[in-house]
């Protein structure tokens, strides 16, 4: 059907509460495009009737609420005047009651559910609530270990919980709760967040430092093979993940079908006070579509990118 397939990261979600996913893929969705959602390669589009539990709302797919059986691969097809892209989103729904146990055992939780507070600082946690305009969100309540948070050091501001003078006791399991109203019906949204505490920067804390790349461009000829290392220093006891992403998606997921661009196996060298980690990205064959795209190396909260660019023409050859 001439549509280019793009594979997004897995989303791990909680059952029995609303969920929405916006089909945006800049620069594709910045112009005049039509967006249609499908489930599991079905030829029948997701309903646009707002009374349906699962329906399309402009560019969003909206679940009111999400149920355990909704797990699966959803596709949104973005059609422009002379282009077509099919974005695949893998949704995994789990039954979870935040107060039963720690959410730490869940696989592949995104950064939205794992946040860091910095010791001694005035810091904040964010309640990530992504919904279309048709959904009205009420005030947010915050809980720690299932008790509503109160006290001088805590202030709720919009979608954030401000924590002044962070202490070691502030680590633990948090949840933010809001009431969502859609078409006169109310639903509860509850997001669990595992919070860790880090000390100040340097090797005393757990903010990794990306030595290379340094947010720069690399000249590379079309069709060549390219390997780029990401070098990271971090504490010996760190729990940070290191990976390469493009368009906010792990490169291995993004290029899942073609396997043209892959992340390498991580290696590390141990020093007295820290470790030096290396994880590379391999372009088996550089294509036109790779130019101008930021390929991001992530290491915990740290990021750095490379952008491929065509070499300037060498006029001496003429």
């Amino acid at each position: 059907d001439g549509c280019k397939d793009i594979f997004m990261k897995n989303e791990i979600l909680s059952a029995s509460q609303p969920f929405a996913f916006n089909c945006t893929f800049p620069p594709i969705t910045s112009g005049e495009v039509s967006v249609t959602w499908y489930k599991n390669s079905s030829k029948i589009p997701v309903s646009k009737i707002i009374q349906s539990r699962i329906h399309q709302d402009e560019t969003w797919i909206l679940f009111l609420p999400m149920e355990w059986g909704d797990s699966g691969v959803y596709q949104c097809v973005i059609k422009g005047r002379d282009s077509c892209h099919r974005i695949h989103v893998n949704l995994t729904v789990f039954e979870k009651h935040w107060c039963d146990t720690s959410i730490g055992g869940l696989p592949n939780l995104s950064d939205e559910y794992k946040q860091i507070l910095h010791l001694g600082k005035d810091d904040s946690l964010t309640c990530h609530l992504h919904f279309p305009k048709s959904c009205v969100l009420g005030p947010i309540k915050w809980y720690k270990d299932c008790n509503e948070i109160k006290g001088e050091r805590f202030t709720v501001l919009e979608t954030r919980l401000l924590v002044s003078n962070v202490s070691a006791e502030d680590r633990g399991n948090y949840a933010c709760q809001a009431i969502l109203t859609h078409s006169g019906k109310q639903y509860e949204v509850l997001n669990g967040i595992t919070v860790s505490i880090t000390e100040r920067a340097g090797y005393g804390g757990s903010v990794p430092k990306i030595i290379y790349p340094k947010n720069h461009s690399i000249e590379v000829q079309l069709g060549t093979t390219l390997i780029v290392d990401c070098n990271v220093t971090d504490t010996k006891d760190n729990t940070n993940l290191r990976c390469w992403r493009v368009n906010n998606t792990l490169v291995d997921d993004y290029y899942d079908e073609s396997k043209r661009i892959r992340e390498g196996v991580e290696t590390h060298v141990s020093f007295r006070e820290h470790n030096l980690y290396t994880v590379n990205i391999t372009f088996l064959e550089v294509k036109m579509e790779d130019y101008g795209l930021p390929f991001m190396c992530h290491a915990g909260v740290s990021t750095a990118y490379i952008i491929l660019q065509l070499p300037a023409p060498d006029f001496r050859a003429y």
Epitope: K121, D122, D123, T155, L162, S164, R200, A201, G202, V301
Partner: antibody, heavy 118, light 107 residues
Framework: EVMLVESGGGLVKPGGSLKLSCAAS????????MSWIRQTPEKRLEWVAT????????YYPDSVKGRFTISRDNANNTLYLQMRSLRSEDTAMYYC???????????WGQGTLVTVSA | EIKMTQSPSSLSASLGDTITITCRAS??????LTWYQQKPGNIPKLLIY???NLHTGVPPRFSGSGSGTDFTFTISSLQPEDITTYYC?????????FGGGTKLEIK
């Protein structure tokens, strides 16, 4: 809507004193740390002072330490900056700002101009 | 005192371009870097806090990244209203220090 209104600026001779005020509305003033930040005629921004929400902690750069005093009146939603022994290099537009988290100055006043000149 | 070196001090770009401004700290500041925008005759406006977090209401074409000593501020698809001056501020340790500013101009 959050509003911050500074006052008290003006022309003063070197060695003189001024007291700046900043009246806040539209926010629970007592919950937030506050800062004074100035902008020199060359458009350089300089941090001048910060006070914690409960008035317990104050911080200054060496360039103003001992000469400037930041204080607050939470009952009246007002922030102050007492400036003594003023120097020509203190000439600047002085802004008060509400700090949401460390260094995150989300709301600023329109500023009050302080000119130190003989 | 931590010195913040902001570069370039001025930058010419065309509308629709992607531009990058960098701030380098003289020592490790973790993620405690804030980016501000100031239009002529106006007050500074918060854009990004803690190196990479977008302030409420700021368009997603603005982004920040980095940690430690090297930080980047990016505007993708430059708009006419973005042609102004940008500052970084480190708040890892006292005294807090600003970068010298970057003035954007139309090419």
């Amino acid at each position: 809507e959050v509003m911050l209104v500074e006052s008290g600026g003006g022309l003063v001779k070197p060695g003189g004193s001024l007291k700046l005020s900043c009246a806040a509305s539209g926010i629970t003033f007592s919950r937030f740390a506050m800062s004074w930040i100035r902008q020199t005629p060359e458009k350089r921004l300089e941090w001048v002072a910060t006070i914690s929400s409960g008035d317990m902690y104050t911080y200054y750069p060496d360039s103003v330490k001992g000469r400037f005093t930041i204080s607050r009146d939470n009952a009246n939603n007002t922030l102050y900056l007492q400036m003594r022994s003023l120097r020509s290099e203190d000439t600047a537009m002085y802004y008060c700002a509400i700090m949401i988290t460390t260094g995150e100055h989300a709301y600023w006043g329109q500023g009050t101009l302080v000119t130190v000149s003989a | 005192e931590i010195k913040m070196t902001q570069s370039p001090s001025s930058l010419s770009a065309s509308l629709g371009d992607t531009i990058t401004i960098t701030c380098r700290a003289s020592q490790d500041i973790s993620v405690w870097l804030t980016w501000y925008q100031q239009k002529p005759g106006n007050i500074p406006k918060l854009l990004i806090y803690k190196a990479s977090n977008l302030h409420t209401g700021v368009p997603p074409r603005f982004s920040g990244s980095g940690s430690g000593t090297d930080f980047t501020f990016t505007i993708s698809s430059l708009q006419p209203e973005d042609i102004t001056t940008y500052y970084c501020l480190q708040s890892q340790s006292y005294p807090w220090t600003f970068g010298g500013g970057t003035k954007l101009e139309i090419k």
